[in-house]
């Protein structure tokens, strides 16, 4: 590895191309470590407030973690000549709260993007598509890692965080080639209805450690390539027939359902029957009831229909307050 002090050469064109001279092709920015052999640049934990302007053209793997970037403007990585080799970009834990449309434009080889652990109060609908066209040029992204990007409550906007993220995922149908999507630890209460339909190539979907209560309005039908679906540590109470049938119909899928507060009443009967016969659910023998109290910690696979009853709903005249 080499580390070098920087000169004034190079800069991206942020909307207006007000910048500098083209970079020396193998120069290492100040505060970064570079390995041309590994095609890797690491500018980690350096309190950077902007993306370095003089990145070497050979960079394939760029780590900008643990900085203070705050905002990624349009063309944040655009260079003349472009960073044509950049394939993996890790921006996790860099205090980003704003990612604008076109932030990742002019990165023709970008296959993996990690924005995890940034409190994204604003994620432009066009952050990944780069344009506001109804159908935009396909993004080269194959892996998109967005774990723990939910901002603190006082920084959340009026519109739903789920909706903001969903809009960025579906804009321009740009992410049709996405294979991996991680959305863990985002306090999601629901999954917007049409998101998955726009991501037909998904093989791995991580929605663990959210607050999903139901999958009733989510369709997995299009995800014929899906291999792993992580739904651990949510607030799921039961999976209904439509969801069960869709999951069963996916040829390669493995579903992870641990640590959800399953409600073992009469509505659980279909799910229990399905669990007993399916090979789709990994660790299904670990799934236990959380409610009602009398069923707590009972193993779902050990239940039978007689165990799964619902208290009768009393007519209003017989109800007591």
């Amino acid at each position: 590895t080499s580390s070098a002090s920087s000169s004034s050469s190079s800069a991206p064109f942020l909307a207006s191309a007000a910048s500098a001279q083209p970079p020396l092709p193998d120069q290492c920015p100040a505060l970064c470590e570079c390995s041309e052999a590994a095609r890797t640049v690491k500018c980690v934990n350096r309190n950077l407030t902007e993306v370095p302007t003089d990145l070497p053209l050979y960079v394939r793997n760029l780590f900008l973690t643990g900085n203070q970037l705050a905002v990624l403007p349009a063309g944040a990585f655009a260079r003349r000549p472009p960073l044509a080799e950049l394939a993996a970009l890790n921006l996790s834990g860099s205090r980003l709260d704003e990612v604008r449309g076109g932030a990742f434009e002019h990165l023709p080889s970008l296959r993996q993007l990690d924005l995890s652990h940034n409190p994204l109060a604003y994620l432009s609908p066009f952050a990944f598509s780069g344009s506001n066209a109804s159908i935009s040029a396909p993004s080269p992204l194959v892996e998109l890692i967005l774990n723990h990007i939910v901002p603190p409550d006082d920084k959340r906007q009026n519109r739903s965080f789920e909706g903001m993220v969903a809009a960025a995922l579906v804009a321009g149908r740009a992410l049709q080639g996405l294979h991996l999507l991680e959305l863990a630890s985002n306090h999601f209460l629901y999954l917007p209805r049409d998101v998955l339909a726009q991501l037909p190539s998904l093989r791995y979907l991580d929605l663990s450690n959210n607050s999903l209560v139901s999958l009733t309005y989510v369709s997995f039908r299009n995800l014929t390539h899906l291999e792993s679906l992580h739904l651990e540590d949510n607030a799921l109470k039961v999976l209904h027939n439509g969801t069960l049938a869709e999951l069963q119909g996916l040829p390669h899928v493995r579903v992870f359902l641990d640590n959800n507060p399953w409600v073992c009443d009469c509505h659980m009967a279909d799910m229990v029957t399905w669990l007993k016969q399916t090979g789709v659910v990994q660790g299904k023998d670990r799934l236990t009831c959380a409610f009602p109290e009398k069923m707590r910690n009972r193993v779902l696979l050990e239940l039978n229909s007689a165990d799964l009853d619902c208290d009768p709903i009393l007519p209003p005249s017989l109800q007591t307050s």
């Epitope: 002090s5 920087s6 004034s8 050469s9 190079s10 800069a11 942020l14 909307a15 207006s16 007000a18 910048s19 500098a20 920015p29 100040a30 505060l31 970064c32 500018c43 350096r46 309190n47 950077l48 407030t49 902007e50 993306v51 370095p52 302007t53 003089d54 203070q68 705050a70 905002v71 403007p73 349009a74 709260d97 704003e98 604008r100 109060a121 604003y122 920084k155 906007q157």
Partner: antibody, heavy 120, light 111 residues
Framework: DVQLVESGGGLVQPGGSRKLSCAAS????????MHWVRQAPEKGLEWVAY????????YYADTVKGRFTISRDNPKNTLFLQMTSLRSEDTAMYYC?????????????WGAGTTVTVSS | DIVLTQSPASLAVSLGQRATISCRAS??????????LHWYQQKPGQPPKLLIK???NLESGVPARFSGTGSGTDFTLNIHPVEEEDTATYYC?????????FGAGTKLELK
């Protein structure tokens, strides 16, 4: 007290070169991004160039791109602006200014300025 | 480039009255997380001085008679009550993108 003191201005012929300096004191220079801003006689303010705290990022106005180079020496608490191929329209008062970051920042401290006159 | 249009170019206000200066951007300079518009005061023969950052946040040490409002493309600097020492030129500036640009300035004089 935050202090920025520019120097190096003077009379330069068109096509000539000049190097401006800005000496900083009263704050941790290496923690702040720095700008050069200029003001032509009886005119408004024009942003010229920016350098990040650790010299990882550099930005220039189109009017000076390729002719001016911003740099800094953190151990010596000094900011520089190397100006080449000077033109009459570069005649101005040149100010250095401090910022906490480029886009999320603002010019929160200014020097008194140094005058550059480009004339034959 | 983003153009900031200040109006009026100059104004004369009586002591104790209100001065209102407008700054209009050619495109939005606000996001849901930050407003990228700042105000400066420049007195003759002196460098500019930061008054208000992010549209409405008073810089430390600036008198409370200065206030800023606005978001998106329309911003206002108010001075009330105007004092003699407020005679100066006032500039707005955006930091939305490169290049950073300033308005042309508004010269405030006392009647």
């Amino acid at each position: 007290d935050v202090q920025l003191v520019e120097s190096g201005g003077g009379l330069v012929q068109p096509g000539g070169s000049r190097k401006l300096s800005c000496a900083a004191s009263g704050f941790t220079f290496s923690n702040f991004g720095m700008h050069w801003v200029r003001q032509a006689p009886e005119k408004g303010l024009e942003w010229v160039a920016y350098i990040s705290s650790g010299s990882t990022s550099f930005y220039y106005a189109d009017t000076v791109k390729g002719r001016f180079t911003i740099s800094r020496d953190n151990p010596k608490n000094t900011l520089f602006l190397q100006m080449t191929s000077l033109r009459s329209e570069d005649t101005a008062m040149y100010y250095c200014s401090r910022t906490n970051s480029l886009l999320r920042g603002f010019f929160d401290a200014w020097g008194a300025g140094t005058t550059v006159t480009v004339s034959s | 480039d983003i153009v900031l249009t200040q109006s009026p170019a100059s104004l004369a206000v009586s002591l104790g009255q209100r001065a209102t200066i407008s700054c209009r951007a050619s495109q939005s300079v606000s996001s849901s997380s930050y407003t990228y518009l700042h105000w400066y005061q420049q007195k003759p023969g002196q460098p500019p001085k930061l008054l208000i950052k992010s549209a409405s946040n008073l810089e430390s040490g600036v008198p409370a008679r200065f206030s800023g409002t606005g978001s998106g493309t329309d911003f206002t600097l108010n001075i009330h009550p105007v004092e003699e020492e407020d005679t100066a030129t006032y500039y707005c500036q955006h930091s939305w993108e490169i290049p950073l640009t300033f308005g042309a300035g508004t010269k405030l004089e006392l009647k």
